[in-house]
């Protein structure tokens, strides 16, 4: 539906508060280095302009597209060239090329200081002094560090952030109330950001068809009682929402997401029996709840898939008539029967089925050719099952920290060219699959584990894309979205890698390690482990384990010593010498 003024339309639909928050998110995700005050000024100017358009949609410039309005505003920033370098060249372009240019300059790993959490009393004072600024600052800091964060979901996080401060700043023990809530929001926020980053990568690197296939599989698992036509409608709408958000069209995205939630709640009966509670909540909670809703029960007595997709004499006819619709139906039918499979496995099966039909429907006897297609699925299903079984066994044996260390060694041997901070970050996240998924029964392990690994490996892919250093990473990241995890799993030691020169400084530790949090101390030790493997990629696990055990004992001993710094200096030298001897460095 055409509106005379797009900006007025979105302002009226979303309301002033959400409009301002979304414009701030959009600007912070584009200009990640700009100071908070500059962004607030730009947002206020845009908001005042939007209000003039609401009053009179025919007013000057009100007919311009949002990209034109926002792009023009961003291009007024005086320090654009000094701060962003070649991104300033985007401003010489016309829409839609200008927006595409801004999108290409989004930085997944911006050079920004780590967010340090102030004392609780300091935060509560800031919250009470100026609640609006305090919450805007939260949106700004998250958005600039996570330039693909799902904007309408960030509004939900901000609402929870506000609620936490409102409640806890009045509590007797403010810290005991607030800190766990902030930790939870931080962890959930990182997970939400990574999940959305995969959706955007899927759309931007592999196209709309790839995203739609993912959505068909996931929604069919979630809503197995819904008809194929209903699932297809939801997939189309969801694809539009995510295409908009990934493209920086945050106002449209939030508006369309609200419409989709409204539609789902109005049509619960034909979608899922699990939506009742979600649909009683306010908008932001409702949308979040729907996105996380548990799978509905499978309809009883679903017929065998073979009848329509293998035994029917019309398979090739149906496929030829509408290939993507037929494959979509196959994916829908397979996914609704298999909530125990990961989405990526379901997509691999659909791809195998498609490849078989492409080959067999051109053969002399198509039916004879594709009759055993389901037999080809067995190894594809067993591969992730075996991998999850093995890794959960190792996780249960080692616990999370040592399991992460095993993965650090594994991935450093596979792709030693990748930067140490990236290897540590990615391997630590890969290792979290254990605590997250291994506790589940068999039927829930694979969707939990493999779909989570897809999200984490996408982090590796987007970080590596910024500074490519490994052909093997590039290959696994770009060849096939659904085969990324099997591609990385299959990698053996990189025989072309020339071991890193030994540098004693890398393995020199100081007393400051003793005052670090447990997490920070782990990261220090894991950084040393990666560096060790980069120096000695042929070291066996037993050798590395012995060195790490000695290292842990060394840190523990020196942190208990009276003269910590002397202990680290003297014992550190001995440890390095012993490790060199043990590993033949």
């Amino acid at each position: 539906d055409a509106h005379k003024s797009e900006v007025a339309h979105r302002f009226k639909d979303l309301g002033e508060e959400n409009f301002k928050a979304l414009v701030l998110i959009a600007f912070a995700q584009y200009l990640q280095q700009c100071p908070f005050e500059d962004h607030v000024k730009l947002v206020n100017e845009v908001t005042e302009f939007a209000k003039t358009c609401v009053a009179d949609e025919s007013a000057e410039n009100c007919d311009k597209s949002l990209h034109t309005l926002f792009g023009d505003k961003l291009c007024t920033v005086a320090t654009l060239r000094e701060t962003y370098g070649e991104m300033a060249d985007c401003c010489a372009k016309q829409e839609p090329e200008r927006n595409e240019c801004f999108l290409q300059h989004k930085d997944d790993n911006p050079n920004l200081p780590r967010l340090v959490r102030p004392e609780v009393d300091v935060m509560c004072t800031a919250f009470h002094d100026n609640e609006e600024t305090f919450l805007k600052k939260y949106l700004y800091e998250i958005a600039r560090r996570h330039p693909y964060f799902y904007a309408p979901e960030l509004l939900f996080f901000a609402k929870r952030y506000k609620a936490a401060f409102t409640e806890c700043c009045q509590a007797a023990d403010k810290a005991a109330c607030l800190l766990p809530k902030l930790d939870e929001l931080r962890d959930e926020g990182k997970a939400s950001s990574a999940k959305q980053r995969l959706k955007c990568a899927s759309l931007q690197k592999f196209g709309e068809r790839a995203f739609k296939a993912w959505a068909v599989a996931r929604l069919s698992q979630r809503f197995p009682k819904a008809e194929f036509a209903e699932v297809s409608k939801l997939v189309t709408d969801l694809t539009k929402v995510h295409t908009e958000c990934c493209h920086g069209d945050l106002l449209e995205c939030a508006d369309d997401r609200a419409d989709l939630a409204k539609y789902i709640c109005e049509n619960q009966d034909s979608i899922s029996s699990k939506l009742k509670e979600c649909c009683e909540k306010p908008l932001l909670e409702k949308s979040h709840c729907i996105a996380e809703v548990e799978n509905d029960e499978m309809p009883a007595d679903l017929p065998s898939l073979a009848a329509d997709f293998v035994e029917s004499k019309d398979v090739c006819k149906n496929y030829a008539e509408a290939k993507d619709v037929f494959l979509g139906m196959f994916l829908y039918e397979y996914a609704r029967r298999h909530p125990d499979y990961s989405v990526v496995l379901l997509l691999r099966l659909a791809k195998t089925y498609e490849t078989t039909l492409e080959k067999c429907c051109a053969a002399a006897d198509p039916h004879e050719c594709y009759a055993k297609v389901f037999d080809e699925f067995k190894p594809l299903v067993e591969e992730p099952q075996n991998l999850i079984k093995q890794n959960c066994e190792l996780f249960e044996q080692l616990g999370e920290y040592k399991f992460q260390n095993a993965l650090l060694v594994r991935y450093t041997k596979k792709v030693p060219q990748v930067s140490t901070p990236t290897l540590v970050e990615v391997s630590r996240n890969l290792g979290k699959v254990g605590s997250k998924c291994c506790k589940h029964p068999e039927a829930k392990r694979m969707p939990c584990a493999e779909d989570y690994l897809s999200v984490v490996l996408n982090q590796l892919c987007v970080l590596h894309e910024k500074t490519p250093v490994s052909d093997r990473v590039t290959k696994c990241c770009t060849e096939s979205l659904v085969n990324r995890r099997p591609c990385f799993s299959a990698l053996e030691v990189d025989e072309t890698y020339v071991p890193k020169e030994f540098n004693a400084e890398t393995f020199t530790f100081h007393a400051d390690i003793c005052t670090l949090s447990e997490k920070e101390r782990q990261i220090k030790k894991q950084t040393a482990l990666v560096e060790l493997v980069k120096h000695k990629p042929k070291a066996t696990k037993e050798q590395l384990k012995a060195v790490m055990d000695d290292f842990a004992a060394f840190v523990e001993k020196c942190c208990k010593a009276d003269d910590k710094e002397t202990c680290f200096a003297e014992e550190g030298k001995k440890l390095v010498a012993a490790s060199q001897a043990a590993l033949g460095l």
Epitope: N386, Q390, E393, A406, S489, E542, K545
Partner: nanobody
Framework: QVQLVESGGGLVQPGGSLRLSCAAS????????MGWFRQPPGKEREFVAS????????YYADSVKGRFTISRDNAKNTGYLQMSSLKPEDTAVYYC?????????????????WGRGTQVTVSS
């Protein structure tokens, strides 16, 4: 240090059988998983089969499933690979390996110790 010695290789006709053994000495064999890998002429080393430390989980490459059986006797510090319905494409040097995690991984770099290999030739 674990030492591994393979035996049982040889020349066999297509359709025939062979049983490979892997004798271990050194630390306690039952704490290690065992794997069999092979290297066909002019090709990369590839996974064949593995068995975890307790012997209750076994894994096979798709190409040998249903034809090969891996087993172990912890009392004898020995692992076995029973190969039947052999094909010319099974011709390779077969290596036994030990994994200190006790899991029985598919990747060769996960194994700490290796034998020197035994030649298996399938030809008429």
């Amino acid at each position: 240090q674990v030492q591994l010695v393979e035996s049982g290789g040889g020349l066999v006709q297509p359709g025939g059988s062979l049983r490979l053994s892997c004798a271990a000495s050194g630390p306690i064999f039952s704490t290690y998983a065992m794997g069999w890998f092979r290297q066909p002429p002019g090709k990369e080393r590839e996974f064949v089969a593995s068995i975890n430390r307790s012997g209750d989980s076994t894994y096979y490459a798709d190409s040998v499933k249903g034809r090969f059986t891996i087993s172990r006797d912890n009392a004898k510090n020995t692992g076995y690979l029973q190969m039947s319905s052999l094909k010319p494409e099974d011709t390779a040097v077969y290596y036994c390996a030990a994994d200190s995690d006790g899991i029985g991984w598919f990747n060769s770099f996960e194994y700490d110790y290796w034998g020197r290999g035994t030649q298996v030739t399938v030809s008429s």
